[in-house]
């Protein structure tokens, strides 16, 4: 057993990044940190369980940004983040540090959280060693921190697996059963090979120099590039220098509670189902009783709050704890060039002229689905539509009854009569034609226009 300790030194804009604080126009805020430890060096999905443990910091001091001021390093919570581990310290692990902002304004639902930055480091670290310092960048942010793993007595060693008792201490307290076998005394840490890098090397046996991840050489002074052989196991091949398969550490599946085993260099790793963690998924983890769902998410567990959980997230949030804000506008839900507005509680589309509907899906200038009344027909053109109305009807949708005689279509004093199929002109004496447009000569011949070329007078005449 032991404790992993993390000390955050600073969090603020990195070189050339974040000229303005993210707090501007958001009102008072404060930071807190979440640390997540996973065994092994595999690249894991952010959602997989923190199998070695996790911890949440206290909230930092309340901070209100002056909108035009450049963002300084942001005020941090006091104290260490401590993640206790029950079993052996694995030596190789993934460290995930999340920086969260808590907004304390008057927004609906009380404080809102947003993830400012997440850094992931895969590291080799011996328990009992010195503090290791690191600087990590996430987007425009820079995080400076130190970390170490230390054993808690009676556990000792670089993996906290050996038990000891202090010199001259009795083996058991009064009235207790005999203790587990203990070494005779707590030995001093082994003396490493002379010259072994204090920063990049460590030893479990006197005279050796073992290197942390990313370093090589007899004294761990030489940085290494990633080898393509890293994921293999077994004895070294003389031809390639790579490892060749040997017996598998996952044989017999050491993972409890439905965990699945995957092999890591020289070891194994359990991917635990939600609600369990530990090297072999033997430890029950976060439950609904811990209130794990952010942003108003509802916690769903088994028959009681102490079983494994999931979070039902409100709209606009996702992640196993509803901690990630969804940019719902990135899905481009507004059609026809509409402007998307994510109001938090709802999505709105501001439509361009000529479009309507919740997602701007209705084209107001489109004949599709557009009805012209009273037998009118829809005619598209010029990005708009109009109705060509049947005789006797008018208006935008042909809904208005038109008076065909209103325009006085009958010439020369002819009288207009509205008829179901149009209009009829009763011509005054001396006139004829559909609109009484032609005078009648006394000899009975109308003054018709001249005959078109090729027609002789007296031939039947057709006029449009």
């Amino acid at each position: 057993a032991g404790v992993f300790e993390l000390q955050i030194h600073s969090f603020g804009p990195g070189p050339g990044g974040a000229p303005r604080s993210p707090y501007s126009a958001r009102g008072p805020c404060r930071l807190f940190f979440r640390v997540c430890l996973k065994p092994g060096l595999s690249e894991e999905a952010a959602e997989s369980p923190c199998a070695l443990g996790a911890a949440l910091s206290a909230r930092g001091p309340v901070y209100t940004e002056q909108p035009e001021a450049p963002a300084p390093d942001l005020p941090l919570p006091n104290g260490l983040l401590q993640v206790p581990f029950r079993d052996a310290w694995p030596g190789t692990f993934s460290l995930i540090i999340e920086t969260w902002r808590e907004e304390l304004g008057d927004q609906i639902g009380g404080p809102a959280w947003s993830l400012l930055a997440r850094v992931t480091r895969r590291r080799r670290l011996a328990a009992g060693g010195p503090w290791a310092g690191d600087i990590q960048r996430a987007g425009a942010w820079e995080l400076r921190f130190s970390y170490r793993a230390r054993c808690e007595l009676p556990a000792v060693g670089t993996a906290c697996t050996r038990l000891c008792r202090p010199r001259s201490a009795s083996r058991c307290g009064p009235g207790l059963r005999p203790c587990a076998p203990l070494e005779d005394e707590c030995e001093a840490p082994p003396v490493c090979r002379a010259g072994c890098s204090l920063e990049h090397g460590f030893c479990e046996q006197p005279g050796e120099c073992r290197c942390l991840e990313g370093w090589t050489g007899p004294l761990c002074m030489v940085p290494v590039s990633t080898s393509s052989c890293l994921g293999l196991r077994g004895p070294s091949s003389t031809t390639t220098g790579c490892l060749v398969p040997g017996p598998g550490p996952c044989d017999g599946n050491p993972c409890a509670n439905g965990g699945s085993c995957s092999e890591t260099p020289g070891s194994f790793e359990c991917t635990c189902p939600r609600g369990f963690y530990g090297l072999r998924c033997e430890v029950s983890g976060v439950t609904c009783a811990d209130g794990p769902c952010f942003n108003g998410g509802l916690c769903v567990g088994g028959a009681d709050p102490d079983s494994a959980y999931i979070c039902h997230c409100p709209p606009g949030f996702q992640g196993s704890n509803c901690e990630k804000r969804v940019d719902r506008c990135s899905l481009q839900p507004c059609r026809n060039g509409g402007l998307c507005l994510d109001l938090g509680h709802a999505l709105r589309c501001r439509c361009r002229a000529g479009f309507a509907g919740p997602r701007c899906e209705h084209d107001l200038n489109d004949c599709a689905g557009r009805a012209c009344a009273n037998g009118g027909t829809c005619v598209e053109g010029g990005g708009a539509h109009r109705c060509s109305c049947a005789l006797g009807f008018g208006g935008r949708d042909c809904r208005e009854r038109a008076d065909p005689c209103a325009a006085r279509p009958c010439a020369h004093g002819g009288r207009c009569y509205a008829h179901f199929s149009g209009l009829v002109c009763a011509c005054a004496p001396g006139y004829m034609g559909a609109r009484c447009e032609f005078p009648v000569h006394p000899d009975g011949v109308s003054a018709l226009p001249a005959a078109p070329p090729g027609l002789r007078p007296g031939d039947p005449q057709r006029y449009p």
Epitope: L56, I108, G109, G110, P111, C288, A289, G291, P292, F294, N295, G296, G297, L298, C299, V300, G301, P305, H312, P314, P315, H345, A346
Partner: antibody
């Protein structure tokens, strides 16, 4: 304004299934909220039965888990309760209610529909 | 399950009097992440469905008269009506939403 209206048979025989419909007007059930069924027994005791969220996730009272199903028809903006193997103890007034994620409060209740389980 | 109990089961008061009723949960309803108590109070008048009065133990729902006040944290909560009116005749329920949803047994207020 959001309106919820319960409907379904007022009398169900023992061992049969109770099926109720909640018709929602004024708001799309796929936009937000969790849509609950809550019942009130003759002695006035209130019991939350389960919900279906705006995205179709469901959660039920563990004591009813083997008998209850909440589903929805988004095209009709309705959600449904089905309770199997009913007994006289399921006689109650059944309310459909929407709940607000931010406040975890049961914001708006339908008028309720009375269901009697009797042969 | 989280069990909610209320006391008294009923009380009779005169208009203008101050009333307090109590609600107790079998486990803490305080969420350390959100710094909130997930407890609500509901009012059910005769022949009507319940209506939310208070959420987060002490936040008054909009439109609720300020004579209604919620207080308490953890496992012990109180609803106070500073000056009872005739229209406050109802049954009052507390409800936890820390994990699932459980209602209290109710307090019947008679004027």
């Amino acid at each position: 304004d959001v309106q919820l209206q319960e409907s379904g048979p007022g009398l169900v025989k023992p061992s049969q299934s109770l099926s109720l419909t909640c018709s929602v007007t004024g708001y799309s059930i796929t936009s937000d909220f969790y849509w609950n069924w809550i019942r009130q027994f003759p002695g006035n005791k209130l019991e939350w039965m389960g919900y279906i969220t705006y995205d179709g996730s469901t959660n039920y009272d563990p004591s009813l888990k083997n008998r209850i199903s909440i589903t929805r028809d988004t095209s009709k903006n309705q959600f449904f309760l089905k309770l199997n193997s009913v007994t006289a103890e399921d006689t109650a007034t059944y309310y459909c209610v929407y709940g607000d994620f931010n406040r975890h409060a049961m914001d708006y209740w339908g008028q309720g529909t009375s269901v009697t389980v009797s042969s | 399950d989280i069990v909610m109990s209320q006391s008294p089961s009923s009380l009779a008061v005169s208009a203008g009097e101050k009333v307090t009723m109590s609600c107790r949960s079998s486990q803490s309803l305080f969420n350390s992440r959100t710094r909130k108590n997930y407890l609500a109070w509901y009012q059910q008048k005769p022949g009507q469905p319940p209506k939310v009065l208070i959420y987060w133990a002490s936040t008054r729902e909009s439109g609720v008269p300020d004579r209604f006040t919620g207080s308490g944290s953890g496992t012990d909560f109180t609803l106070t009506i500073s000056s009872v009116q005739a229209e406050d005749l109802a049954v009052y329920y507390c409800e936890q939403s820390f994990y699932l949803f459980t209602f209290g047994t109710g307090t019947k207020l008679e004027i």
